[in-house]
């Protein structure tokens, strides 16, 4: 059976299988029966990240400081710039086009996972035996105080928002 399609890194034009341009280069002219594909490197602040037949390179992403963005990884001729958010902020989407402040975990909830430049704070309810009495983006649920180890007794039970209150043992009891 004869060949009917071009090889992996080729494209078909005018019955001719031409080599695609490699990442970091754009197409200047298609090959012909008598000439090779002509490719040129992308310019400063441009990139192409795949084998391609594009006549224009893509512009690197701009990390706008006004949107809370900063450069995490500078782009090359083969890769786009990667943006991340300033301290205290995280991306609103995977493409990180803008930033919002990290959320705090309300009283009764603790931080399960601290936020990063690309992910928000993850909160979890404080389980029995633990509490959080602050609104925080960093604090985990803390364990209730153990009155026994201090030779005290529980005077007021703890909740998910409050610690137990310890007091002296009642000496009146027999």
């Amino acid at each position: 059976e004869p060949p009917t399609a071009c090889r992996e890194k080729q494209y078909l034009i005018n019955s001719q299988c031409c080599s695609l341009c490699q990442p970091g280069q754009k197409l200047v002219s298609d090959c012909t029966e008598f000439t090779e594909t002509e490719c040129l490197p992308c310019g400063e602040s441009e990139f192409l990240d795949t084998w391609n037949r594009e006549t224009r390179c893509h512009q690197h992403k701009y990390c706008d400081p006004n949107l809370g963005l900063r450069v995490q990884q500078k782009g090359t001729s083969e890769t786009d710039t990667i943006c991340t958010c300033e301290e205290g902020l995280h991306c609103t989407s995977e493409s990180c086009e803008s930033c919002v402040p990290h959320r705090s975990c309300l009283p009764g909830f603790g931080v399960k996972q601290i936020a990063t430049g690309v992910s928000d704070t993850i909160c979890e309810p404080c389980p029995v035996g633990f509490f959080s009495n602050v609104s925080s983006a960093f604090e985990k649920c803390r364990p209730w105080t153990s009155c026994e180890t201090k030779d005290l007794v529980v005077q007021q039970a703890g909740t998910n928002k409050t610690d137990v209150v310890c007091g002296p043992q009642d000496r009146q009891r027999a």
Partner: antibody, heavy 121, light 112 residues
Framework: QVQLVQSGTEVKKPGASVKVSCKAS????????MHWVRQAPGQGLEWMGW????????KYTQKFQGRVTLTRDASVSTAYIDLNRLRSDDTAVYYC??????????????WGQGSLVTVSS | QSALTQPASVSGSPGQSITISCTGT?????????VSWYQQHPGKAPKLMIY???RRPSGVSNRFSGSKSGNTASLTISGLQAEDEAEYYC???????????FGGGTKLTVLG
């Protein structure tokens, strides 16, 4: 312009191995398959196999299966042929040749200058 | 043994035309335009002269032409010149995932 420059003459003993290189320039190396063809003294052309310089995939003719290995180093645009368990009848000029395709046909448009391998005890 | 059959030798005088035949089967030469022709001078690498039966690469003289009839492809050289004296190989490309088959080669002698 497209050029395929091969390594020099080799003299080997029977049972030994030989590695011939083919350095490509003037085109996008991973974009075109590379074929290897040999020619024994006073004989015709004999196709041995091809390599896809992008993926490293290979195809060999039955006769050379298991004794020939085609490899490439895309970072230096070079294809290699390794022939082991050499015999005297492997004495030949070994050529690399670039494949060019159209919709219905492929052909070998550029050839290296050839590398003579002599197998003699 | 080659799957493509060529005459071992042909000859002609300067200025004459000669034709080299290449006979295959209905599954290669007969069915598809898969034949190419290569010229090889002694001690030199083969050079592509004709591909896809009758197409000429850039730089190849228009004295070289290709044709096909049934299961036989032919290379014709018109206005024969001394530098045309060489070995000529036909080649069938039997599909991208199969292999290349060469004819046995034809020695062209330019007389005189």
């Amino acid at each position: 312009q497209v050029q395929l420059v091969q390594s020099g003459t080799e003299v080997k003993k029977p049972g030994a191995s030989v590695k011939v290189s083919c350095k490509a320039s003037g085109y996008t190396f991973p974009g075109y398959y590379m074929h290897w063809v040999r020619q024994a003294p006073g004989q015709g052309l004999e196709w041995m196999g091809w390599i896809n310089p992008d993926s490293g995939g290979t195809k060999y003719t039955q006769k050379f299966q298991g004794r020939v290995t085609l490899t490439r180093d895309a970072s230096v645009s070079t294809a290699y042929i390794d022939l082991n368990r050499l015999r005297s009848d492997d004495t030949a000029v070994y050529y690399c040749a670039r494949e060019r395709c159209r919709t219905t046909n492929c052909y070998l448009d550029y050839w290296g200058q050839g590398s003579l391998v002599t197998v003699s005890s | 043994q080659s799957a493509l059959t060529q005459p071992a030798s042909v000859s002609g005088s300067p200025g004459q035309s000669i034709t080299i035949s290449c006979t295959g089967t209905s599954s290669d030469v007969g069915n598809y335009n898969l034949v190419s022709w290569y010229q090889q001078h002694p001690g030199k690498a083969p050079k592509l002269m004709i591909y896809e039966v009758n197409r000429r690469p850039s730089g190849v003289s228009n004295r070289f032409s290709g044709s096909k009839s049934g299961n036989t492809a032919s290379l014709t050289i018109s206005g024969l010149q001394a530098e045309d004296e060489a070995e000529y190989y036909c080649c069938s490309y039997a599909g991208r995932d199969t292999f290349v088959v060469f004819g046995g080669g034809t020695k062209l002698t330019v007389l005189g």
